[in-house]
Amino acid sequence: ADPGKKFKNSTYSRSSVDVLYTFANCSGLDLIFGLNALLRTADLQWNSSNAQLLLDYCSSKGYNISWELGNEPNSFLKKADIFINGSQLGEDFIQLHKLLRKSTFKNAKLYGPDVGQPRRKTAKMLKSFLKAGGEVIDSVTWHHYYLNGRTATKEDFLNPDVLDIFISSVQKVFQVVESTRPGKKVWLGETSSAYGGGAPLLSDTFAAGFMWLDKLGLSARMGIEVVMRQVFFGAGNYHLVDENFDPLPDYWLSLLFKKLVGTKVLMASVQGSKRRKLRVYLHCTNTDNPRYKEGDLTLYAINLHNVTKYLRLPYPFSNKQVDKYLLRPLGPHGLLSKSVQLNGLTLKMVDDQTLPPLMEKPLRPGSSLGLPAFSYSFFVIRNAKVAACI
Amino acid sequence: ADPGQDVVDLDFFTQEPLHLVSPSFLSVTIDANLATDPRFLILLGSPKLRTLARGLSPAYLRFGGTKTDFLIFDPKKE
């Protein structure tokens, strides 16, 4: 059946914009605002008049915002019975770019086209979009979900075959970008475990962390510059923070990632053939962390085996002191727990204004790094003196 | 039990970075649909939520999703 016109238009007010901007600003986050791309003239050109009203308002308030235009335009046909091809969308972005240059937003960033996964037609749309409008965007954005939230199972969340599917999607996007706009930065503009709001009783549990950490690791290793997690807060099951403002396991995992993982991406691999259930990633350590210094390494690892694995570091790192940050689920629900322990201590906020300290467990130099079955962990190799990290 | 069979040797490549990601590499979204929630202003005003968000700074906050293309700005709306 033709599903067209499933969605009703809604309006939002100046105060909605204010609260969104204030939230981002007070939290130290840079706001990227998605503009409606389905406002069209009779000949299917983008009608920019509503965007202009918003730009004028944000300008008057001095808001520093970046912009997108449209969300998953490859699905406009399904959502609204309108087909906009990539070239037309590219022209629309050029029009928006001109609006931004005319306003106080002349240095505002523009990202797009926020296409879905790179299937045949979507990849074609991305390619023609980039040919037409790729010059005016600052990064190429696309979306990825592993599964359908309605049908996903716990087994899917722990299946390396499912995790590996992401690799070919990233490769396809890079193929399109490199053939049209070589060197243009690629971002995951929206991503999570399962679409449709996530998988109930899975996307908000410890089990979701395997997908999240693996996606972060693979994205960094494959050259994706930014990964935007759907969602920080809101409806569904894939939120980092629930409706009671309580942080879920993926929030704590994200917080640890932020504190420990730096921007320089290195390479770690497992020797031998049994690599797919034991997944390892390596970066320079985040030097904003006062405990660590330039030259230190952060290894993060995922164990999908049903037995503990002991990781042995290569020379010359095997005798360095290592700080371990092991995440494990808390309570009788096991992998389906919504609470998490860091090195055996339950993670929870001290009070509404205070995050807990993320306490490391120093390991004896030379000891192998134990990673229990179905767990994930960060290991900071101290005093590693890696030249590439200095 | 002898852990020997479950010892795994790692290889590292540390000569040079493969890539450089953004300091905002790990970023987050708020779904545009949240703007239609009558409690939108209250929810995002929560000091606890802001504390949690601050923990992930620096990051981008992308406001978008399916509802993006079904939202219209009304500057006259109260």
């Epitope: 059946a1 046909l77 087909f83 045949r120 | -």
Partner: antibody, heavy 117, light 107 residues
Framework: EVQLVESGGGLVQPGGSLRLSCAAS????????MSWVRQAPGKGLEWVAS????????YYVDSVKGRFTISRDNAKNSLYLQMNSLRAEDTAMYYC??????????WGQGTLVTVSS | AIQLTQSPSSLSASVGDRVTITCRAS??????LAWYQQKPGKAPKLLIY???SLESGVPSRFSGSGSGTDFTLTISSLQPEDFATYYC?????????FGQGTRLEIK
């Protein structure tokens, strides 16, 4: 209501030609990829060809390449399949279908092509 | 070309039964798989797209799952109108291919 109606099938000798048509209504024809799919008597489904919205891109199964041509006339809301050098193994019910990124959501009732001497 | 192998080729079942049909791809196709139902003398009807999304208007007793190379179509409680032939189809890459079909008949 979305409708796809095929026509042009019939009996033809090996080596002969036929042109199938598909009349579309109830949707914006020019917005959709369109396809031809066939089914030999008592057999399974086989994709034959697909065409981009504006007709600029066409794809074919190997067994019909060089013999069949898919085309469309968006002004007439019509899809065509020109079949030349027909063989006995081309005998089948031919369906036109509306193609999305995830499959074919609407199909015609089919038109039967019989290639026999 | 990507080959799809359905199993079983035919299946006898009774009204109310739970039935599962599997489809295996010769290489990974992400979730780019659809399932169709075809009754004699009729055109196929789309049931499931994207491996697990239910096409609108299709009864919820039909469900799909899988990703990569292994996929399943499940009918949770067979109804008389469900006796038909079922096909899986991959649309990950050209040429688009179908499984050979699974005939579901009344026991």
């Amino acid at each position: 209501e979305v409708q796809l109606v095929e026509s042009g099938g019939g009996l033809v000798q090996p080596g002969g030609s036929l042109r199938l048509s598909c009349a579309a209504s109830g949707f914006t024809f020019s917005s959709y990829w369109m396809s031809w799919v066939r089914q030999a008597p008592g057999k399974g489904l086989e994709w034959v060809a697909s065409i981009y919205q504006d007709g600029s891109e066409k794809y074919y199964v190997d067994s019909v390449k060089g013999r069949f041509t898919i085309s469309r006339d968006n002004a007439k809301n019509s899809l065509y399949l020109q079949m030349n050098s027909l063989r006995a193994e081309d005998t089948a019910m031919y369906y036109c279908a509306r193609e999305l990124d995830w499959g074919w959501d609407y199909w015609g009732q089919g038109t039967l092509v019989t290639v026999s001497s | 070309a990507i080959q799809l192998t359905q199993s079983p080729s035919s299946l006898s079942a009774s009204v109310g039964d739970r039935v599962t049909i599997t489809c295996r791809a010769s290489q990974g196709i992400s979730s780019a798989l659809a399932w169709y139902q075809q009754k004699p003398g009729k055109a196929p009807k789309l049931l499931i797209y994207d491996a697990s999304s239910l096409e609108s208007g299709v009864p919820s007793r039909f469900s799909g799952s899988g990703s990569g190379t292994d996929f399943t179509l499940t009918i949770s409680s067979l109804q008389p109108e469900d006796f038909a032939t079922y096909y899986c189809q991959q649309f990950n890459s050209y040429p688009i291919t179908f499984g050979q079909g699974t005939r579901l008949e009344i026991k």
